[in-house]
Structures are given as structure tokens and as C-alpha cells.
């Protein structure tokens, strides 16, 4: 879908990954001055969510709120403008926003190979495993947008594991990972404990924690 | 004023499919969601699927699962509805109607049906 | 075998003030979806009558009125006349896997001589 009006920007707060009956605030903004504001989940027939938008200092923008999170509210996620209503003349749609349910299963164990403490240069590998079936491992890291995922291996000493190469070390961080079933791609496990990774003989050593932006005020629509 | 003008009445054989069109004229159609519902004779109403299609989204009801396929042509402001492997028990009046995207299930405007016989 | 059920048939003399009631259940009414209400009079298409709960489009007369409560909703309509002789049928969506949108059994609404 093309659209008249170039596409709106599509944001979690606090993230994308959302615990169990916890909340995420789907914000849509723009530069445009869209009137309404226009969320679907993809997939679904009757997912779609309006909003009318407000505008501020030149952006328009609506906050959805998503929750309590279950299952059925995990998903694909697009947000369109429009400055029209009945009909609508939507914009081309957002970047796609999968919205994840964590908290689901026990979690994983995260370790580290050679140890969580590295040399900087030096190759270190971070290892998910757990004894459930898990068919597939994410690995987050805090202050990045997106997970890295692999499949889990066959079962090796009563465990399914996957193994993370990160390459040679730069700078460290703090590491999460999650297990999902292929035909629940949205519904992940537990948080694993965090992990986290230190880099010496390297002047930038540590990973900052993100700031989260705040949510925005306004009435937000509510899908649940 | 819009109008959703549905393709004329047929006979089918068993085993055999029926496509049925629904054109919207005197308005725009990619803007709202295509749903498809027939009523067999002296019964109710039973919705099959609809289509969404600016989202391209289309959902299909678990009675119909595998057997109907509907779809949208933007270009030519119509949508379809095709039903395979018919039996007698799909002889009914198959009607295509409107919602809002944000209300797909309230059907503000109907096609005027069409009738699909299934006889051998 | 209807998701939502209705009464097969209700009747009244003119002017009079009937009720058609929609039961559905927790996956459906009761989860907080809106009910729609249709009239179809003889040998033509549905025409949405009642949108949203309670809401009339243009051109419907407010001598009818719809509302919800629960897992049920109900149509009444006031100062029955002729020309309301038809079948109503209610609807509403359900998260449940038995489908996406579904209907009541439909409502026979006859108007007494």
C-alpha cells in the first residue's frame, strides 16, 4: 500500500518486549498533521484501533495502549495516518513492530564461553539453554531495539541450547535471553538472568543503560 | 451514495467452485473491509470471511477454512468470494457486505445478493 | 446451532412494544464486543439497523432502540407498526476459534391484524 502521505513512525514504551498482564504504549508520530491515527495488528480482521492525533511542535502523534498483555494482543503491529475520516485516506503504513508477550515459560540459563569477564579482541560466545524444548533462543541486549535469534540445537545432555557468537570483544554489556516455540513466534519464556558481559583493556567498558523516553501524556485508546 | 453490485446468479455442479464478484460503484473501496455472508433457504445469516484490503489482511471463518478464498482488486474496485469443492448445502444467497476499517463487523451497505444453486 | 441465540419469533399488535433478546457468552458480548442488529424484510438484503450497542444510522427510525448488558444484548421497538414485519438478526465478534464475526439465529417479528 503506497498511501498519499508518507508513513508515520510506529514506537514501544518502554519496549517491545512485554511481561505478561503488563502494559506497552504503542506511540504513532509524525511530521505530518494527521488528524487521525490508525492501528491494526496484522493479521487479524478486527484489529484496528483510531485515535485522533494530537499535535505539538509541528509533530502529531497518538498513544495506544496495549494491555493487560495476553497472548491474543501479541503480534505485528503497523500504524497509518490519515487526514480524512470516512473514508480514511491512510498514509503508507509504519515499519512493522513485532510486540512480544515474555514471561510465559521458565527461563533459560545464559552463560558465557570463556567467561563473562574478556579481553577486549578477544572472541566470546554467550550459550542459552534450558531443559524445556524450547525450538528457538532470542538474545537481547539492554539499550538495543532488536534481539538476535537462532534455533535451539538438538538435545545434548538433557538440554536444548543455542549458542551466540558475538565476535571479537569491543565493549560489554547486559545480556538477556528468551526461549519460543515455532508456532508461537510472539510468546516467549521467561527472562533468563541477566548477564553481564565485561570488557577489559578497552577505554569503553561498560554499556550504558538506556534512557527510556517517558510515555507521553494523553489519552491513550486501550486494546484488551 | 456507494453501492456494492454483486455478479448474477448460478447453477453449479457438485464438486465443482463459484467466484462471485462484488463491485463497489460511487465510491472508493480500499478504505474499508469486505466481508462475505451467505443464508441458505428459510435459515440464517453466516459469515464466511472478509478482506481488508488496504491492510491486506483477509480471515476466513473455521466452517470455511480451506474452502473459500476471498480477495480484492483495488484497480477495478471489486472484491471476490470463491468457494470450492460445493455441495447441495451450499445452495444459498451469498452476499458481500461493508464495514469501517475500524468497525469491520457493522455492515452499513449490502450487495443484492446472488443466488449459487449447487445441483447435480 | 447459533453462536448467539435468539428467540425464533416474537410477535405484537400495532403500537405496541416488543423486545428481541441476543445471549452470547463470554467470548463474545460478555468480552466487551459490540452488537449489531439487522432487519431483512422478504426477499431482500440485510440492513444494519442498530450499530454499536445503541447506535441508529440515518435514516432509522428512533422508534427503535438497541442495548447491552453482560453476555446479552436486546433490540426493542416501540409503536410497532406493518411495515416492521421482518426478520431481525443480531451480531457480534468472537475471539473464541469458533470464527471471527457471528450472527443470532434470527428473530420472526410479526405484526398482529
Known amino acids: 500500500h503506497e498511501g498519499v502521505h508518507r508513513k508515520p513512525s510506529l514506537l514501544a514504551h518502554p519496549g517491545p518486549l512485554v511481561k505478561s498482564e503488563e502494559t506497552v504504549i504503542l506511540q504513532c508520530w509524525s511530521d505530518v498533521r494527521f488528524q487521525h491515527f490508525l492501528l491494526h495488528r496484522e493479521g487479524k480482521f478486527k484489529d484496528t484501533l483510531h485515535l485522533i492525533g494530537e499535535h505539538h511542535d509541528g509533530v502529531s502523534k497518538a498513544n495506544f495502549s496495549i494491555g493487560p498483555m495476553m497472548q491474543d494482543l501479541a503480534g505485528t503491529y503497523r500504524c497509518y495516518g490519515s487526514v480524512t475520516h470516512s473514508p480514511y485516506q491512510l498514509s503508507a503504513p509504519s515499519d512493522p513492530l513485532d510486540i512480544v508477550i515474555t514471561g510465559l515459560y521458565e527461563k533459560p540459563s545464559l552463560s558465557a564461553q570463556p567467561g563473562p569477564t574478556v579481553l577486549a579482541g578477544e572472541s566470546v560466545t554467550l550459550s542459552c539453554s534450558s531443559r524445556s524444548s524450547y525450538d528457538m533462543y532470542h538474545l537481547s541486549r539492554e539499550g538495543e531495539a532488536h534481539e538476535r535469534r537462532f534455533s535451539a540445537g538438538p538435545k545434548v545432555n538433557g538440554t536444548f541450547q543455542a549458542d551466540f557468537p558475538l565476535g571479537p570483544a569491543t565493549h560489554g554489556g547486559t545480556y538477556r535471553c528468551f526461549g519460543s516455540f515455532r508456532d508461537s513466534p510472539y510468546e516467549w519464556s521467561n527472562s533468563s538472568d541477566p548477564l553481564l558481559v565485561s570488557v577489559t583493556g578497552n577505554p569503553s567498558n561498560s554499556w550504558p543503560s538506556p534512557t527510556e523516553p517517558s510515555s507521553e501524556t494523553g489519552n491513550p485508546r486501550h486494546l484488551h | 451514495q456507494v453501492q456494492l453490485v454483486q455478479s448474477g446468479a448460478g447453477v453449479k455442479k457438485p464438486g465443482s467452485s463459484v467466484k462471485v464478484s462484488c463491485k463497489a460503484s460511487g465510491g472508493t473501496f480500499s478504505s474499508y473491509a469486505i466481508s462475505w455472508v451467505r443464508q441458505a433457504p428459510g435459515q440464517g445469516l453466516e459469515w464466511m470471511g472478509g478482506?481488508?484490503?488496504?491492510?491486506?489482511?483477509?480471515n476466513y471463518a473455521q466452517n470455511f477454512q480451506g474452502r473459500v478464498t476471498i480477495t480484492a482488486d483495488e484497480s477495478r474496485n471489486t472484491a471476490y468470494m470463491e468457494l470450492s469443492s460445493l455441495r447441495s448445502e451450499d445452495t444459498a444467497m451469498y452476499y458481500c457486505a461493508r464495514g469501517e476499517l475500524v468497525d469491520p463487523d457493522a455492515f452499513d451497505i449490502w450487495g443484492q445478493g446472488t443466488l449459487v444453486t449447487v445441483s447435480s | 446451532q447459533s453462536v448467539l441465540t435468539q428467540p425464533p419469533s416474537v410477535s405484537g399488535a400495532p403500537g405496541q412494544r416488543v423486545t428481541i433478546s441476543c445471549t452470547g457468552s463470554s467470548s463474545n458480548i460478555g468480552a466487551g464486543y459490540d452488537v449489531h442488529w439487522y432487519q431483512q424484510l422478504p426477499g431482500t438484503a440485510p440492513k444494519l439497523l442498530i450499530y454499536?450497542?445503541?447506535n441508529r444510522p440515518s435514516g432509522v427510525p428512533d422508534r427503535f432502540s438497541g442495548s447491552k448488558s453482560g453476555t446479552s444484548a436486546s433490540l426493542a421497538i416501540t409503536g410497532l407498526q406493518a411495515e416492521d414485519e421482518a426478520d431481525y438478526y443480531c451480531?457480534?465478534?468472537?475471539?473464541?476459534?469458533?470464527?471471527?464475526?457471528?450472527f443470532g439465529g434470527g428473530t420472526k417479528v410479526t405484526v398482529l391484524a
Open positions: 451480531q457480534s465478534y468472537d475471539s473464541s476459534l469458533s470464527g471471527y464475526v457471528v
Open positions: 454499536g450497542n445503541s
Open positions: 478482506i481488508i484490503p488496504i491492510f491486506g489482511t483477509s
